[in-house]
Interface confidence: low
């Protein structure tokens, strides 16, 4: 009789993670007898994997009733395949032996292939704001892909970007890789409503990346400018001096007017209004009792946005000519209801 | 952009022998398990044969000992060598990339293949 | 080998009209199955992979069921562009065959 062979079919076996992968196994004889085992691996180090005599494998099923007498199918399913199942296996059949069964016959090995997702791309800014025309970095990452080829793109509002570089790890075979994007951004005044995408495509997402983004709003500091106006009022001893803080993001703004360098009053921004870009105007105005200064009052608007060094803008303020004869510039706006008396 | 380009058809004389090519860009061939199939004149598809990630092949039983599938990685190029070719290989072929879960989603756009004399 | 046998290989139907297509597997494939749309002088296009699952952009009015050797493809409201060429193809173990194709005509 022809001596016993064992048959592994498949030479390779591709299973997405997550999945059950069947690794087929048959003998063309029940001679000699004694027991079939599955090893991943080959040589001293190799990894049991199922053994038909003993042991528990929660993982492993076999396809056929291997308690059946004339049985010759040695197939096994492997179930929740994840990336570190990624190897060879080995069907090996064992004859029966005294005190211990002997190695008999080894299957040529069928290698398992493991397809895993990469995980959902996380960007991240800079930890600290910046203004426009300054660049700024963004990291993007993912992990937990097989295989390690893979596609990384970065775009701005939908436009691709190319200054970037890409790592994926490690350099050599593992099991499962990891990606690391740095992309460089010029910031504009109109980034605020602007978004930042990484974009990785890999085999197992059938055509369908998968994205992680980062708002600018969350990077860029707009500051403000500034434009200190006055217009008469009915009162003939009164002028509105208006301060207009024009454009800035983020909305945290403190303004301090200031009377010939003493400071007056201090006030956050509160009721802005957006403009389209998602920057924010705001204004605040001072009604200011002229007949009771007899030289010329040098007002200052003093504003420190987010933390920053203050800008100001000054105004003089003549108290020898008539009210009414001041040039003056109609308020854009009148957001802030600020009175203040000077006697 | 992921795509596949075959090239290599033409006019062959019964006997003779072709060797076809799929040039792959946007990914790396030796990555995927890559396919070639024909299609012969008002035919149906017919599975020719498959290289996987570690190199080994498997072939339909009519092309076994007369077609080989090899692949360039430095190329990022796949083969099929044709020999002893009959009137009946005449057909349109076609390289096809594997999905990871099953089936090919990436396909060339074919090459002729005339076999005659 | 595994064969694969498709019917019907003609089918005539209008606009609007529940479709379905069977595939047959000489042996067990559990769901290693797909199926593919032709048309004339274009490479395949990938609808259905592991017998039920809608591959990347295509129409939900296509759906595939089956596992083991019986297998379907159902587009429940055809529409002018379905007028094709479709085949089921096997890739369990090392074997990749199609089904002879179904022609899905205008009645």
């Known amino acids: 009789e022809e001596e016993l062979q064992v048959i592994q079919p498949d030479k390779s076996v591709l299973v997405a993670a997550g999945e059950t992968a069947t690794l087929r196994c048959t003998a063309t004889s029940l001679i000699p007898v004694g027991p079939i085992q599955w090893f991943r691996g080959a040589g001293p180090g190799r990894e049991l994997i199922y053994n038909q005599k003993e042991g528990h494998f929660p993982r492993v099923t076999t396809v056929s009733d291997l308690t059946k007498r004339n049985n010759m199918d040695f197939s096994i399913r492997i179930g929740n395949i994840t990336p570190a199942d990624a190897g060879t296996y080995y069907c090996v059949k064992f004859r029966k032996g005294s005190p211990d069964d002997v190695e008999f016959k080894s299957g040529a090995g069928t290698e398992l292939s493991v397809r895993a997702k990469p995980s959902a791309p996380v960007v991240s800014g800079p930890a600290a704001r910046a203004t426009p025309q300054h660049t700024v970095s963004f990291t993007c990452e993912s992990h937990g892909f097989s295989p390690r080829d893979i596609t990384l793109k970065w775009f701005k509002n939908g436009n691709e970007l190319s200054d970037f570089q890409t790592n994926v790890d490690p350099v050599g075979e593992s099991v499962s890789y990891s990606i690391h994007s740095t992309a460089k951004v010029v910031l504009t005044r109109e980034d605020v409503h602007s978004q930042v995408i990484c974009e990785v495509a890999h085999v197992t997402l059938q055509g369908d990346p998968l994205r992680g983004t980062a708002n600018l709003s969350e990077t860029i500091r707009v500051p403000p400018t500034l434009e200190v106006t006055q217009q008469p009022v009915r009162a003939e001893n009164q002028v509105n001096v208006t301060c207009q803080v024009r454009k800035f993001y983020p909305q945290r703004l403190q303004l301090t007017w200031l009377e010939n360098g003493n400071v007056s009053r201090t006030e956050t921004a509160s009721t802005v209004t957006e403009n389209k870009d998602g920057t924010y105007n705001w204004m605040s105005w001072l009604l200011v009792n002229v007949s009771a200064h007899r030289d010329d009052v040098k007002l200052t608007c003093q504003v420190e946005h987010d933390g920053q060094p203050a800008v100001s803008k000054s105004h003089d303020l003549k108290v020898s000519a008539h009210p009414k004869e001041q040039g003056s510039n109609t308020a854009a706006e009148n957001t802030g209801s600020n009175e203040r008396n000077i006697y | 952009e992921v795509q596949l380009v075959e090239s290599g058809g033409g006019l062959v004389q019964p006997g003779g022998s072709l060797r076809l090519s799929c040039a792959a860009s946007?990914?790396?061939?030796?990555?995927?398990?890559m396919i070639w199939v024909r299609q012969a004149p008002g035919k149906g598809l017919e599975w020719v044969g498959i290289?996987?990630?570690?190199?080994?092949?498997h072939y339909a039983s009519w092309a076994k000992g007369r077609f080989t599938i090899s692949r360039d990685n430095s190329k990022n190029t796949l083969y099929l060598q044709m020999n002893s070719l009959r009137a009946e290989d005449t057909a349109v072929y076609y390289c096809?990339?594997?999905?990871?879960?099953?089936?090919?989603?990436?396909w060339g756009q074919g090459t002729l293949v005339t076999v005659s004399s | 080998d595994i064969q694969m046998t498709q019917s019907p290989s003609t089918l005539s139907a209008s606009v609007g009209d529940r479709v379905t297509i069977t595939c047959q597997a000489s042996?067990?494939?559990?769901?290693?199955l797909a199926w593919y749309q032709q048309k004339p002088g274009k490479a395949p296009k990938l609808l259905i992979y592991d017998a039920s699952k809608l591959a990347s952009g295509v129409p939900s009015r296509f759906s595939g069921s089956g596992s083991g050797t019986e297998f379907t493809l159902t587009i429940s409201s055809l529409q002018p562009d379905d007028f094709a060429t479709y085949y089921c193809q096997s890739y369990y173990g090392n074997s990749y065959p199609f089904g002879g194709g179904t022609k899905v005509e205008i009645k």
């Open positions: 946007g990914f790396s061939l030796s990555n995927y398990e």
């Open positions: 096809g990339r594997y999905l990871a879960s099953g089936g090919f989603n990436i």
């Open positions: 042996h067990n494939i559990y769901s290693n």
């Open positions: 290289i996987y990630v570690s190199r080994s092949t």
